[in-house]
Amino acid sequence: QAVPPYASENQTCRDQEKEYYEPQHRICCSRCPPGTYVSAKCSRIRDTVCATCAENSYNEHWNYLTICQLCRPCDPVMGLEEIAPCTSKRKTQCRCQPGMFCAAWALECTHCELLSDCPPGTEAELKDEVGKGNNHCVPCKAGHFQNTSSPSARCQPHTRCENQGLVEAAPGTAQSDTTCKNPLEPLPPEMSGTMLM
């Protein structure tokens, strides 16, 4: 098993993740591990020399970079917030602020926008990842209602009047809850749509 640096006639190295082909010397050399950078390039007589990234800089992968990448804060102006700080091995981890979704993506989210409101009678379809896309509003399923314009309100089950010792005065809709009344009192016309105790 050859240890870098070693000769490579076909310009490929055995371990593509941890080695790279250096064309001037026509050899395979070690890459530097995450959290480090190349402080001295390899040659036929010595392997790559690596050094640790300085504070506030990082390299995420096995690399042959001669510098570390500068840590960047999550930009609140772009609607981003930090979920994990930058380390020598990983860039700052950002996500969209609550109530926002990612509107521009370039390897990572660069710009978040406010989620659209879902109108009464609908709710935002649940997604695998929060903040990945704008709301897709879906109607409340049978027996549920949602009575506000909101990006985050969920459809709630209609009140079951009998569970409260009451009777139904008016059925619930997708946009309103069931109206209940005391079974002993008739519902005056002007009180319809409200619950009487």
Epitope: A7, E9, Q24, H25, R26, S43, R44, I45
Partner: antibody, heavy 120, light 107 residues
């Protein structure tokens, strides 16, 4: 038989330009890294430029970086050295050289050389 | 850059003599050293590569030895055609560097 024949040398004024050529024959030119070396009158040998087999990579010592450009045309089996901003210290015999393409990296064939004189 | 110190810079010897030329590298060059012979007005000619290996067509009176930082070219029995200048070259690390040369003259 491997042959490397340089041409294009001559007398040039300081600050001037010159293009050297090297015609290769007797081997598969596109399989080899090629080099230019030089030798000033009565002096030792000095590496000047390297180009990879496909021409994608070029390398220079600090003494010529930014002034000299090595290139190749594999279809024509030709190597070139474009020299600009020439100085008196660039006066030398320039050799076109082939690097062995195995694992030992020695320089196995040299051209006869072409003379470049930089003088006012 | 790796400095190559070649000695002697000139040497007078007679036909039949055994001659030794040395090259000292500024650091371990792992045998990436070759030797070249150059006659006046001619291009250098490869003699030895990888410190000890004889190039094709080179007479067996030429030999190379050494490792690490110290290398030697030996001509076991000088012939008239051997009077020339000899150069060592390290090609372990760019920039490639030559020794200053040894001019071998007839005594």
């Amino acid at each position: 038989e491997v042959q490397l024949v340089e041409s294009g040398g001559g007398l040039v004024k300081p600050g001037g330009s010159l293009r050297l050529s090297c015609a290769a024959s007797g081997f598969t030119f596109s399989d080899y890294y090629m080099y230019w070396f030089r030798q000033a009158p009565g002096k030792g040998l000095e590496w000047v430029a390297t180009i990879s087999d496909g021409g994608s990579y070029t390398y220079y010592p600090d003494s010529v970086k930014g002034r000299f450009t090595i290139s190749r045309d594999n279809a024509k089996n030709s190597l070139y050295l474009q020299m600009s901003s020439l100085r008196a210290e660039d006066t030398a015999v320039y050799y076109c050289v082939r690097e062995e393409n195995g694992n030992f990296y020695y320089f196995d064939y040299w051209g006869q050389g072409t003379t470049v004189t930089v003088s006012s | 850059d790796i400095q190559m110190t070649q000695s002697p810079s000139s040497l007078s010897a007679s036909v039949g003599d055994r001659v030794t030329i040395t090259c000292k590298a500024g650091q371990d060059i792992k045998s990436y050293l070759s030797w070249y012979q150059q006659k006046p007005g001619k291009a250098p000619k490869l003699l030895i590569y990888y410190a000890t290996r004889l190039a094709d067509g080179v007479p067996s009176r030429f030999s190379g030895s050494g490792s690490g930082t110290d290398y030697t070219l030996t001509i076991s029995s000088l012939q008239p055609e051997d009077f020339a200048t000899y150069y060592c070259l390290q090609h372990g690390e760019s920039p490639w560097t030559f020794g200053g040369g040894t001019k071998l003259e007839i005594k």
